[in-house]
């Protein structure tokens, strides 16, 4: 007969015989034969292979190293990664999140859109009119401009994007 | 009883079951001694090619008539050491385990001058 | 190839006795074990395969176990008819090969 030229899910072409994959979490020992199943054999402590698989080494897990401000965000299993996460006040410089960067702050004039998580770096904004910001902050929203009139007061000093307005008394007129 | 140098050949008729379907298999058993597997002939699907311990390759042959259910074992070149009770057996299963599940009565064979 | 050793080569027992006969493999067969009872008459079956599988018909006092290289057939309580020779053989690799046998006899 003709041997198999392609096999079912979770099979492999070997030595012209589907033999079974090795399920996530094991490694493969041992190709099936003609008599005999695949042998696999469960990934070590801090091991794990994600698929069905016919690997002969199960991957290590990700070490989280807190040199570079990572930490263990989950641990991993046999069948999962360890995912890495950044200590507070650090974002991931990429996807995999092989290193931390300190949160960017929004200098004066530009105040945080979007606070910066774990994977993420903060989000600035300009501040628009009617908006200002003195300080460089990882945190601060642009704040709006004192209003004056709501104090029975008249503005003094314009605001600006870095400044609160200036509030005075009115000019009284004499008689 | 056969002279050593000299040939025999032994059948076995089966009935019950599909016999293409199977691979068959023989074993002898040497007088007071333990069962030695000699070599078998893979199914219709596999293509009836055969296996053999060394102890007999290139001596004995296994064929199989698949519209008579016969199996046949071809012993060439025979030797004292060939005396034995001779045993066809079905051999099945899955890649959980192979065995012989179905066995014939045994023929007995004595190879002498 | 593989050696397959069964050391008891011969015991005695008496009806309703539990008895254990072992075999060993030269290298690890991973389960791919079969156990196999001949008569007296000649006449061979097949009891358990794969280690621990009972093939059908056969009575449930006996049962298999075993791992790696060392392996057991156990008859938990025995009767006439189980007098007879009983057989280990692994199905791993080509060639096939058996023990040397445990004849099971009466005290």
């Known amino acids: 007969p003709e041997p198999p030229t392609a096999c079912r899910e979770k099979q492999y072409l070997i030595n012209s015989q589907c033999c079974s994959l090795c399920q996530p979490g094991q490694k493969l020992v041992s190709d099936c034969t003609e008599f005999t199943e695949t042998e696999c054999l469960p990934c070590g402590e801090s091991e794990f292979l994600d698929t069905w698989n016919r690997e002969t080494h199960c991957h290590q897990h990700k070490y989280c190293d807190p040199n570079l401000g990572l930490r263990v965000q989950q641990k991993g299993t046999s069948e999962t990664d360890t995912i890495c996460t950044c200590e507070e006040g650090w974002h991931c410089t990429s996807e995999a999140c092989e290193s931390c960067v300190l949160h960017r702050s929004c200098s004066p004039g530009f105040g945080v859109k979007q606070i910066a998580t774990g994977v993420s770096d903060t989000i600035c904004e300009p501040c628009p009119v009617g908006f200002f910001s003195n300080v460089s902050s990882a945190f601060e929203k642009c704040h709006p401009w004192t209003s004056c009139e709501t104090k029975d007061l008249v503005v003094q000093q314009a605001g600006t994007n870095k400044t609160d307005v200036v509030c005075g008394p009115q000019d009284r007129l004499r008689a | 009883l056969v002279q050593p140098g000299g040939s025999l050949s032994l059948s076995c008729a089966a009935s019950?079951?599909?016999?293409?379907?199977?691979?068959m298999s023989w074993v002898r058993q040497p007088p007071g001694k333990a069962l030695e597997w000699l070599g078998f002939i893979r199914n219709k699907a596999n293509g009836y090619t055969t296996e053999f311990s060394a102890s007999v390759k290139g001596r004995f042959t296994i064929s199989r008539d698949n519209s008579q259910s016969i199996l046949y074992l071809q012993m060439n070149a025979l030797r004292a050491e060939d005396s034995a009770t001779y045993y066809c057996?079905?051999?099945?299963?899955?890649?959980?385990?192979?065995?012989?599940?179905?066995w014939g009565t045994g023929t007995t064979v004595t190879v002498s001058s | 190839d593989i050696q397959m050793t069964q050391t008891t080569s011969s015991l005695s027992a008496s009806l309703g006795d539990r008895v254990t006969i072992s075999c060993r493999a030269s290298?690890?067969?991973?389960?791919?074990l079969n156990w196999y009872q001949q008569k007296p008459d000649g006449t061979v079956k097949l009891l358990i395969y794969?280690?621990?599988r009972l093939h059908s018909g056969v009575p449930s006092r006996f049962s298999g176990s075993g791992s790696g290289t060392d392996y057991s057939l156990t008859i938990s309580n025995l009767e006439q008819e189980d007098i007879a020779t009983y057989f280990c053989q692994q199905g791993k690799t080509l060639p096939w090969t058996f023990g040397g046998g445990s004849k099971l006899e009466m005290k």
């Open positions: 290298q690890d067969i991973r389960n791919y």
């Open positions: 057996a079905r051999y099945g299963g899955l890649r959980q385990g192979w065995y012989f599940d179905v």
């Open positions: 019950g079951f599909t016999f293409s379907d199977y691979y």
């Open positions: 794969y280690t621990s």
